[in-house]
């Protein structure tokens, strides 16, 4: 089943997705869509990057990390209950059937009523301990035979829980990563 991430109404939700470019600036097109990943591309695209830049985005959806280094994690600003559902991150690696797709489930909870104001947390409160993706077997090393200069060396697991927004930067070392090159 999809990996589940949580946020409260009014927060910014964070959906992690990473790859490692073969070389600086050697980017791979990525799309984010609302709904499970279809056979090609992303359905209901909310954001897209190409080999150079973010070339399409919609209101409230943005990349907070450094996408030029492969951090294509999606931030959804000021979420509402309607933002609940499955999101697709697709890393469109060139070649024969090389693209990778990840389905992430976002669960939005009503905002907690607290007696005193508290610091708003920007990112989802808890992450599952293991990242699994529909359509993929166990994490393993794969070689992209059609592109001799590109290797898909690792799809790693998300092993940490995000307990506070200050840990967001650590996700690059613990998130779902596709390493190319």
């Amino acid at each position: 089943s999809e990996v589940e991430y949580r946020a409260e109404v009014g927060q910014n939700a964070y959906l992690p997705c990473f790859y490692t470019p073969a070389a600086p600036g050697n980017l791979v097109p990525v799309c984010w869509g609302k709904g499970a990943c279809p056979v090609f591309e992303c359905g209901n695209v909310v954001l897209r990057t190409d080999e150079r830049d973010v070339n399409y985005w919609t209101s409230r959806y943005w990349l907070n990390g450094d996408f030029r280094k492969g951090d294509v994690s999606l931030t959804i600003e000021n979420v509402t209950l309607a933002d609940s559902g499955i999101y697709c991150c697709r890393i469109q690696i060139p070649g024969i059937m090389n693209d990778e797709k990840f389905n992430l489930k976002l669960v939005i909870k009503p905002a907690k009523v607290t007696p005193a104001p508290t610091r708003q947390r920007d990112f989802t409160a808890a992450f599952p301990r293991m990242l699994t993706t529909r359509g993929h077997g166990p994490a393993e090393t794969q070689t992209l035979g059609s592109l001799p200069d590109i290797n898909l060396t690792q799809i790693s697991t998300l092993a940490n829980e995000l307990r506070d927004s200050r840990l967001a930067n650590d996700l690059r070392d613990s998130g779902a990563t596709i390493r190319i090159g």
Partner: antibody, heavy 120, light 107 residues
Framework: QVQLVESGGGLVKPGGSLRLSCAAS????????MSWIRQAPGKGLEWVSS????????YYADSVKGRFTISRDNAKNSLYLQLNSLRDDDTAVYYC?????????????WGQGTTVTVSS | DIVMTQSPSSLSASVGDRVTITCRAS??????LNWYQQKPGRAPKLLIY???SLQSGVPSRFSGSGSGTDFTLTISSLQPEDFATYYC?????????FGGGTKVEIK
């Protein structure tokens, strides 16, 4: 008028080769994924191969992988399928089709088909 | 591979009848299910996309429903031009797969 027209079919001996073409008109060809679908005589539809709008990403059915090659020339609004090492069970009508929205919403434009007959 | 199982494989009906064709996927395909109509010697024609959305130009007597693994194509009042073979197709993952087809014949 949105249109796809296939050509290149014919009679070929087992082990032989053919190159199918699909000429597109009436739409911005480079915006769409494209696919080849085939239908053996009296049988159902079978997906063969697909290619992304830029041509950088390619997909094949296991039954044709290593024998067939899909390609496209966006400057010429053309889709191609190179058929090598043909077998009797490759005999079929071959259709090219446009994948609307990357196929998550189906193949909305089809050509009339070109017939490939593999026989000794 | 995702196996698409269509039923019935054929049916006989009269003009004006309500016809229902079912399609079952071997795994969850969300709403990535399309329906096509094919007449002898012709290319398939897209009728329904994304399980329930009517393709432009298709008569409203055609409708689709379902999500996950079970899907239905309904023709509310069969017309003479509707006698054809109908195929479902999943576009959730490669290989793209079609159902075996349902031939709708005149009773």
């Amino acid at each position: 008028q949105v249109q796809l027209v296939e050509s290149g079919g014919g009679l070929v001996k087992p082990g032989g080769s053919l190159r199918l073409s699909c000429a597109a008109s009436g739409f911005t060809f480079s915006d769409y994924y494209m696919s080849w679908i085939r239908q053996a005589p009296g049988k159902g539809l079978e997906w063969v191969s697909s290619i992304s709008n830029s041509g950088s990403t390619i997909y094949y059915a296991d039954s044709v992988k290593g024998r067939f090659t899909i390609s496209r020339d966006n400057a010429k609004n053309s889709l191609y399928l190179q058929l090598n090492s043909l077998r009797d069970d490759d005999t079929a009508v071959y259709y090219c089709a446009r994948n609307w929205q990357g196929a998550d919403y189906g193949m909305d434009v089809w050509g009339q088909g070109t017939t490939v007959t593999v026989s000794s | 591979d995702i196996v698409m199982t269509q039923s019935p494989s054929s049916l006989s009906a009269s003009v004006g009848d309500r016809v229902t064709i079912t399609c079952r996927a071997s795994q969850n395909i969300s709403s990535y299910l399309n329906w096509y109509q094919q007449k002898p010697g012709r290319a398939p024609k897209l009728l329904i996309y994304a399980a329930s959305s009517l393709q432009s130009g298709v008569p409203s007597r055609f409708s689709g429903s379902g999500s996950g693994t079970d899907f239905t194509l309904t023709i509310s009042s069969l017309q003479p031009e509707d006698f054809a073979t109908y195929y479902c197709q999943q576009s959730y993952s490669t290989p793209l797969t079609f159902g075996g087809g349902t031939k709708v014949e005149i009773k």
